[in-house]
Each structure stands twice: as C-alpha cells, then as structure tokens.
C-alpha cells in the first residue's frame, strides 16, 4: 500500500453567493488526520494519534495551507457561471501517494453539486473531463479561470504537487507512529446459516500498517476466492485498520478450518471455536 | 477600532495569588485565540499560552503549567491569567496579545507591569 | 524547545542605510517566523508574518526572507522612528518561542 495524504475542500454558494468560510478535511494514509475548525481557525488534529503524528509541532503550517486553499476554492466557485438558485457546492479532491518503489502520483478532482467534472495528473499536468455536457461546460469555465489566474500556471501545479509530496515526506519522516508495527487482535465468531451451515468470520482489528493478509483455510490450504467474502480494511478512528473474511462451512467440519493471518512478517492461524 | 486594556500595574506581595484581566472590544471575542506573553526588565519576549475563548481550550507552556491558569468571561469579553505563588522571578510585565489565526499576535495590549514585593 | 539566536545583539545604523536582522533556529521551521517591532515602554507589534507575508498598516520598507532555519529582516531605509528592539518568534513547535531581540540605534 502507498503512503497518502488526501485533502478534501468544499465551499457552498446559495442563490448565486459565495458563502465565507470553508470545509475541509485531510486524511493521511486512509485515516482521518486533521479538520479544519472554522469556530478556532485552524486546522485540527483528529485524535490521538494525528496528535501523535504531529508530536510537539502545532497545526500552523497545516491552517496556513487549508486556509489558502479554501480561499482559492472559494474565487473558483465565484466564476461558476449560470448558478441557479438555491444551495450548491464545489469540491476540490487531491491526492498524492508515495509508493514502496519510491514512485510518486498526484492528482486533484473537482466535483460541482456531487458530480465529478474535472481531474487532472497533476505530475503529467493532463486534464480530463466526463463526458456529460454540464461537466463539459463546468470544465470550460473553470478551466478558463485558472487559466486568467497568473497564479494557476505550470509552476503552480508543479508546486501543488510538490508541496503534498513534501508534507506528505515530513510526517513520514518525523513520525515514529507511521512507522510502528501494531499486530492484529483477531477473533473468530460462528453464526447460524441454512440448515446443517454455519457462517464463520473471522476479524482483525486494530493493526498497523494496513497491509494484511487474511484468508479462510481449510485442511491448512487457502480456499478460493470465490467462496470467501471479504471485508474492506478501514481505519478504526484510533490510527489503526480492520477488517474481515467469513465463509460458510458445514456443521461439524469446524476443525477442519483456521483463520490464516499475516501481518508484518508475522502470521498466526485461529481455529473456529466450538 | 481593536483595543485590549490591561491594567498598567499591580503590586502583589509574594505567596498570594493575583488576576491579571485583559478587557477585549472592537472584536469578535469568542472567536479568536488570546496569547499571553511575559517581559522581565530588560529581558525579551516568553510565550506563557493561549486560550480560546469559545469553549476555554487552552495552550500553556510547559514552563508555565504550576505558575499560571487562563480563563475568561464571555459575558464581558475578558481574559484573565492567574499568577499562584509570585516570587520576585515574576516580576514582570504581562501583554495578551491575539491574531486572526492562533500562531500570529496581530494585537497586543498595553501590558500589565506586575512587582512582587512584601 | 526551539531556540531562536538573533544576531548581533546591537545594531547601530545611519538613517537612509539599509539594516539586516538575523535569525537562526536550532532546527528547520519551515517558514514559521514571525517578526515583531517593540519601542521603548510599547507593546510589541507584528511587522512580518511566515518569514515574508507583509502585514496591512506596516511601512513597505519592512521585509523579511528565510527557511529552515535562517531569516532576515530587512529594513531598507532606516527612519528614526525604526529605533526599537526587534524580535523573531517561531510558531511550528510547541511552545512558541521567541528570540533573544536585537536593539537598532540610529547614529
């Protein structure tokens, strides 16, 4: 899995009106990282361990780019044309991923209303634009604008791309939590299924990193992908991921199969309880 | 116009306590951090910490978390700082100072000149 | 906590002359530094936010520069009312921390 860091800003307008303030978030590695509290005017670490991450420095750095940030989006949505009246939103999505190989890949979004109507590579500078006809005609007009801002030039994109590469860098590098190992709690449950089945699950919890290895073997071999469904590894809010794997055996053969887990280097095979 | 009035002095004796009140107008109180800051005669500037006033989420120095305590009055659009124990090392003149966003002091007050004396 | 050495500690210019400040964290703050100006008996007041961002109301002829861990404040015609002390302050580690000022004299 490569390193992230995701920013999300979105800023609303109503009946044609660009409203002041911003909402913001930034996710580091898939997990809630910081926020921007609007009542404060700062960027806020989310828990404990975006605390962590952060150790002694202070968010000024952080409140200083999503405040910029909010602030561009904000003349951005100003030179949406045609604005019906009402609510209406514009999101700005961007991503940069630091991969194991060293690579790197950046990119930002933007979404009007919820509907996505712009991307670009922001290391290739190559746009791409939905099909759709609104999306068409959103793309042009906020492509124009940046285009007219002299801030909004290659180097502009270069440097926002950077810049989320080198913050991403900093708390790679400064931070002992992003570099930690925390095995997985695992835990096997049955449940009732049709006549003479039963559903087995077995769940990891609270592990980091998030790569993880979790199958269903029966006889010490991997049953198929196909007969197993599986869970998306997510963050649990505390700076560490779960996930899951359940299949449906028959009653009776319940110590034929085990839990197979690796993580880390390690691994561990849980049997199904009786 | 901003202004945040400080008294221009107070004589306190040493071992009591005292409350130092910094008087807020001409802005939004509740809405941004109030920094507290410490000049000894002749010395530089010493970040004591910051409140924010909407909810009393405080920042204190390290140095500074037996000596001093930041509260404040929203009904009045106050500050305070409360000095325990003074000893002659807090002789001292103490400004609040605040900015648009936490990490800058755009404004300052007048400062408090604070003399432990028995 | 970060240290912040500012040198020299006096500074004795002519009016008209252009003055240097400097400004040496103990490690990199980015562009984390703040400047401030404080005259005789005054309360001290910001001059430059983030190393070079002007702030509305100071004379144009204040600047600043820097990263990582060196900044300077210029200041490039002296007036006699630039008599002060003149302090950095870093805001990327708790706690905040300011430096040691350096006085400007006019001749």
């Known amino acids: 899995e490569p390193h992230s860091l995701r920013y999300n800003l979105t800023v609303l307008s109503w009946d044609g009106s660009v409203q002041s303030g911003f909402l913001a978030e930034v996710h580091l590695d898939g997990q809630p990282f910081l926020r921007y509290d609007r009542q404060k005017c700062r960027a806020k670490p989310q828990g404990q361990w975006a605390e962590d991450v952060l150790g002694n420095k202070t968010w000024d750095r952080e409140t200083r780019d999503l405040t910029g940030n909010g602030k561009d989006l904000r003349m951005t949505l100003a030179h949406i044309k045609d604005q019906k009246e009402g609510l209406h939103s514009l999101q700005e999505i961007r991503v940069c991923e630091i991969h194991e190989d060293n690579s790197t890949r950046s990119s930002q979004h933007f979404y009007y209303d919820g509907e996505l109507f712009l991307s670009q590579n922001l290391e290739t500078e190559e746009w791409t634009v939905p099909q759709s006809s609104r999306a068409q005609t959103l793309a042009m007009n906020v492509r124009n604008f940046l285009k007219e801002d002299a801030m909004k030039t290659k180097t502009h994109y270069h440097a926002m791309h950077a810049d989320c590469l080198q913050e991403l860098r900093r708390y790679l590098e400064s931070s002992v939590v992003l570099r930690r190992t925390v095995p997985p709690m695992v835990n096997v449950t049955r449940s009732e299924a049709s006549e003479g089945n039963i559903t087995v699950t077995c769940r990891a919890s609270s592990f980091y990193p998030r790569n993880i290895i979790l199958t269903w073997r029966q006889d010490g071999v991997s049953l198929s992908h196909d007969t197993q469904q599986w869970g998306d590894v997510l963050p649990d809010g505390n700076g560490t991921y779960q996930t899951w794997v359940a299949t449906r055996i028959c009653r009776g053969e319940e110590q034929r199969f085990t839990c197979y887990m690796e993580h880390s280097g390690n691994h561990s095979t849980h049997p199904v309880p009786s | 116009q901003v202004q945040l009035q400080q008294p221009g002095a107070e004589l306190v004796r040493p071992g009591t306590s005292v409350n130092l009140s910094c008087k807020a107008s001409?802005?939004?109180?509740?809405?941004?951090?109030m920094n507290w800051v410490k000049q000894r005669p002749g010395q530089g500037l010493e970040w004591i910490g910051m409140?924010?006033?909407?909810?009393?989420?405080?920042r204190l120095n390290q140095k500074f978390k037996d000596k001093a305590t930041l509260t404040v009055d929203k009904s009045s659009s106050t500050a305070y700082m409360q000095l325990s124990s003074p000893t002659s090392e807090d002789s001292a003149v103490y400004y609040c100072?605040?900015?648009?966003?936490?990490?800058?002091?755009?404004?300052w007050g007048q400062g408090t000149s604070v003399t432990v004396s028995s | 906590d970060i240290l912040l050495t500012q040198s020299p500690a006096i500074l004795s210019v002519s009016p008209g002359e252009r003055v240097s400040f400097s400004c040496r964290a103990s490690q990199s703050i980015g562009t984390s530094i703040h400047w401030y100006q404080q005259r005789t008996n005054g309360s001290p007041r910001l001059l430059i936010k983030f190393a070079s961002e002007s702030i509305s109301g100071i004379p144009s002829r204040f600047s600043g520069s820097g990263s990582g861990t060196d900044f300077t404040l210029n200041i490039n015609s002296v007036e006699s009312e630039d008599i002060a002390d003149y302090y950095c302050q870093q805001s990327n580690f708790w706690p905040f921390t300011f430096g040691s000022g350096t006085k400007l004299e006019v001749k």
């Open positions: 001409g802005y939004s109180f509740t809405r941004y951090w």
């Open positions: 100072g605040y900015g648009n966003f936490f990490y800058v002091m755009d404004y």
């Open positions: 409140i924010h006033p909407s909810d009393s989420e405080t």
